[in-house]
């Protein structure tokens, strides 16, 4: 499970709004860090192991997911045709 935590820096000066969002994710046994619906998530470790990236549903709803060659990552294709590529190191 993940929750988005908003960190407010320098709250003593309300004019300066420097905010950053981080995810705090507590994964269950058999899960590790991944991406679901373009957000940090805990996913089945076997998805990562087998590099079946699209099985973790990394793209936004309505987008199409495709594996890159050699399973080095995935692409998310928007309905309009724009493609976002994510590579895994």
């Amino acid at each position: 499970t993940c929750e988005i935590v908003t960190l407010d820096r320098d709250s003593s000066q309300p004019r300066i709004e420097e905010r950053s969002q981080t995810a705090r994710c507590a994964c269950r046994k058999g899960q590790i860090a991944g991406t679901t619906r373009a957000r940090p998530a805990c996913v089945d470790a076997r998805i990562i192991k087998t590099k079946q990236w699209c099985d973790m549903l990394p793209c936004l709803e309505g987008e199409g997911c495709d594996l890159l060659i050699n399973r080095s990552g995935w692409t998310c294709t928007q309905p309009g045709g724009r493609i976002k590529t994510t590579t895994v190191s």
Epitope: A23, C25, A26, K29, G30, I32, A33, C42, A45
Partner: antibody
């Protein structure tokens, strides 16, 4: 190189308590789940306890549940096992082990016994009166 | 509990296969030359091999059974091999009783 050094073993008395410490080096300690595994005389390996990379989750084997406490100090790169109400059957060699998966920042991750990639040399514990 | 054979034997140069079944998640294989002595991981996460382990060691997962293969076994490979994984409920780690490899 990844190194895990256990200490704290030795002769213990039944009903007493022991505290084992594992000092880690050569890797980003706070990113890895850690284990204690023991080998008792004439037996194989036995899962004792584990702790998540950030220390928020702990789990224990049935033989020590209720008697053991595992904890970690990510600043000092140490993991500790406290075992109370010692019994003769707790005699054995206690190993510290690392799970290979490197958990990224913002995540709390369990290790996996099948993903142990590094072991300490072990520390011997003898429970006897 | 995990199921693995209690012993196997082979001549130098032969191929040895040791199976382990009954667990969940991923499997690892751990070598021990004598009881209480240091443990060495030869395979982790089903088929990953540490960089200092010879390439003759390999692992493969099929269903819920993992097989450790030693291709061209050597005298130095004589040891007890323990498999490890999570129990079927995924609540705790579990190890096999160990397989003694004898190189004839």
């Amino acid at each position: 190189a990844v190194t895990l050094d256990e200490s704290g073993g030795g002769l213990q008395t039944p009903g007493g308590a022991l505290s084992l410490v594992c000092k880690a080096s050569g890797f980003t300690f706070s990113s890895h789940g850690m284990f204690w595994v023991r080998q008792t005389p004439g037996k194989g390996l036995e899962y004792v306890a584990e702790i998540t990379n950030d220390g928020s989750g702990t789990n224990y084997g049935s033989a020590v549940k209720g008697r053991a406490t595992i904890s970690r100090d990510n600043g000092q790169s140490t993991v500790r096992l406290q075992l109370n109400n010692l019994r003769a059957e707790d005699t054995g060699t206690y190993f510290c082990a690392r799970s290979t998966y490197e958990c990224p920042g913002g995540f709390s991750c369990w290790g996996d016994t099948g993903q142990i990639d590094a072991w300490g040399h072990g520390t011997e514990v003898i429970v006897s009166s | 509990a995990l199921t693995q054979p209690s012993s196997v034997s082979a001549n130098p140069g032969e191929t040895v296969k040791i199976t382990c079944s009954g667990g969940s998640y991923s499997y690892g294989w751990f070598q021990q030359k004598s009881p209480g002595s240091a443990l060495v991981t030869v395979i982790y996460w089903d088929d990953e091999r540490p960089s200092d382990i010879p390439s003759r060691f390999s692992g493969a997962l099929s269903g819920s059974t993992n097989t450790l293969t030693i291709t061209g076994v050597q005298a130095d490979d004589e040891a007890v091999y323990f498999c490890g994984t999570e129990d079927i409920s995924g609540t705790a780690g579990v190890f096999g009783a160990g397989t003694t490899l004898t190189v004839l």
